[in-house]
């Protein structure tokens, strides 16, 4: 995490693409994050970034569920969170949101998919009155094309961040897998 | 006071190539991405693209992929606009723009006409 | 990409009317996580560049008359010059500031009877 004072703005979300006529069913199922951006994300080449999963499960109301696993201090951690839909498909905000403390808003905007092999997710919120924003690369595999990953580089950088807020985590066996 | 300023009329030959240049003034430079706007004569505005400044990364519109490319000089805190292999239709006025993080874009240059003939 | 559609195209006025210039999208520009909006207004008077007159659907920048007024949501969106002066003769412009890309809407200018 940057602990830094100074933080990237965010782009204004005219920068921001949304994907068109996106199926929320189609995106249901696992991720890996393959890829990740933000201004609160620092690349550390001493102790680099695992690779987590993200599961989204598609609820009768049409909101997801959303599971992250990590594996952190030799076990699983699980993140749960609701996405509830926006006034677009492909948009959501947080379910609950009164029950984080210090958080005001939480935009998530699928930029762009083709559900079967790559994602790319921009996430926004104001914690404690900053903003923070993120883009993921997400894939159903651990391992995505090097034309993917320039192009979340690419995009990550047409956002305002540079090259040491971008990270490609290392992939792993624990936790993510099964 | 915040100012964007442009460079001057162009009169270029189709298959020529234009650079239009965009100063910046009276703000921090690359605090603000800067946008490129078409205006054909007599008609609406077209966005082309932008340029974050902090990264120097271009972004085109669609229609504006393949001729066109934005730069910067970011110590002479100008941008640039240039326009490869010129056609009839490249005849507009061209203008840039500063995002606001507030929303749109706040302030604009005078714009730059550009007239492509034979 | 996000169509914006404006009407009338052009509008003949008298000094001191009340005017009202109207803006669909083709979706909405609703964020429902903050309750904003993202739509602008310009004003472009000839020979002149573009004027950001309104953001955020309703919020009026900083040295605009309070004679204009940006209303409506999702879809939705009018702007209200509460008495028409001379000096506001132009095209006005809407603008969709929600996602890539920016588009405008094709303009409504407004003339003089």
């Known amino acids: 995490q940057d602990s830094t004072s100074d933080l990237i703005p965010a782009p204004p979300l005219s920068k921001v693409p949304l994907q068109q006529n996106f199926q929320d069913n189609q995106f249901q199922g696992k991720w890996y994050v393959v890829g990740l951006a933000g201004n609160a994300i620092l690349r550390e080449d001493k102790d680099p970034q695992k690779m987590y999963a993200t599961i989204y499960e598609l609820k009768e109301d049409k909101s997801y569920n959303v599971t992250s696993v990590l594996f952190r201090k030799k076990k699983c951690d699980y993140w749960i969170r609701t996405f509830v839909p926006g006034c677009q498909p492909g948009e959501f905000t947080l379910g609950n949101i009164k029950s984080y403390p210090g958080l005001t808003s939480y935009l998530v905007r699928v930029v762009s998919t083709n559900y079967n092999q790559h994602a790319m997710v921009f996430f926004k919120k104001v914690s404690q009155n900053r903003e923070y924003f993120k883009i993921t690369l997400y894939g159903r595999t651990k391992e995505l094309t090097s034309e993917l990953k320039e192009n979340f580089i690419r995009f990550s950088k047409s956002l305002g961040l540079p090259e040491n807020h971008i990270v490609f985590p290392v992939p792993i066996d624990q936790c993510i897998d099964g | 006071k915040i100012q964007l300023v442009q460079s001057g009329p162009e009169l270029k030959k189709p298959g020529e190539t234009v650079k239009i240049s965009c100063k910046a003034s009276?703000?921090?430079?690359?605090?603000?991405?800067m946008n490129w706007v078409k205006q054909a004569p007599g008609k609406g505005l077209k966005w082309m693209g932008w340029i974050n400044i902090n990264t120097g990364e271009p972004t085109y519109a669609e229609e504006f992929k393949g001729r066109f490319a934005f730069s910067l000089e970011t110590s002479a805190t100008t941008a640039f606009l240039q326009i490869n292999n010129l056609k009839n239709e490249d005849t507009a006025t061209y203008l840039c723009a500063r995002d606001s993080y507030s929303g749109g874009f706040d302030y604009w240059g005078q714009g730059t006409i550009v007239t492509v003939s034979s | 990409d996000i169509v914006m559609t404006q009407s009338p195209s052009s509008l003949s006025v008298s000094a001191g009317e009340k005017v009202t210039l109207s803006c669909k999208s083709s979706?909405?520009?609703?964020?429902?996580?903050?309750?904003?909006?993202?739509l602008a207004w310009y004003q472009q008077k000839p020979g002149q560049p573009p004027k950001l007159l309104i953001y955020?659907?309703?919020t009026r920048d900083s040295g605009v008359p309070d004679r204009f007024t940006g209303s409506g949501s999702g879809a939705d969106f009018t702007l209200t010059i509460s008495s028409v002066q001379a000096e506001d003769l132009a095209v006005y412009y809407c603008?969709?500031?929600?996602?890539?890309?920016?588009?405008f809407g094709a303009g409504t200018k407004l003339e003089l009877k």
């Open positions: 955020g659907a309703s």
């Open positions: 603008q969709n500031d929600h996602s890539f890309p920016p588009t």
């Open positions: 979706q909405s520009l609703l964020i429902s996580g903050d309750q904003k909006n993202y």
């Open positions: 009276g703000y921090t430079f690359t605090n603000y991405g």
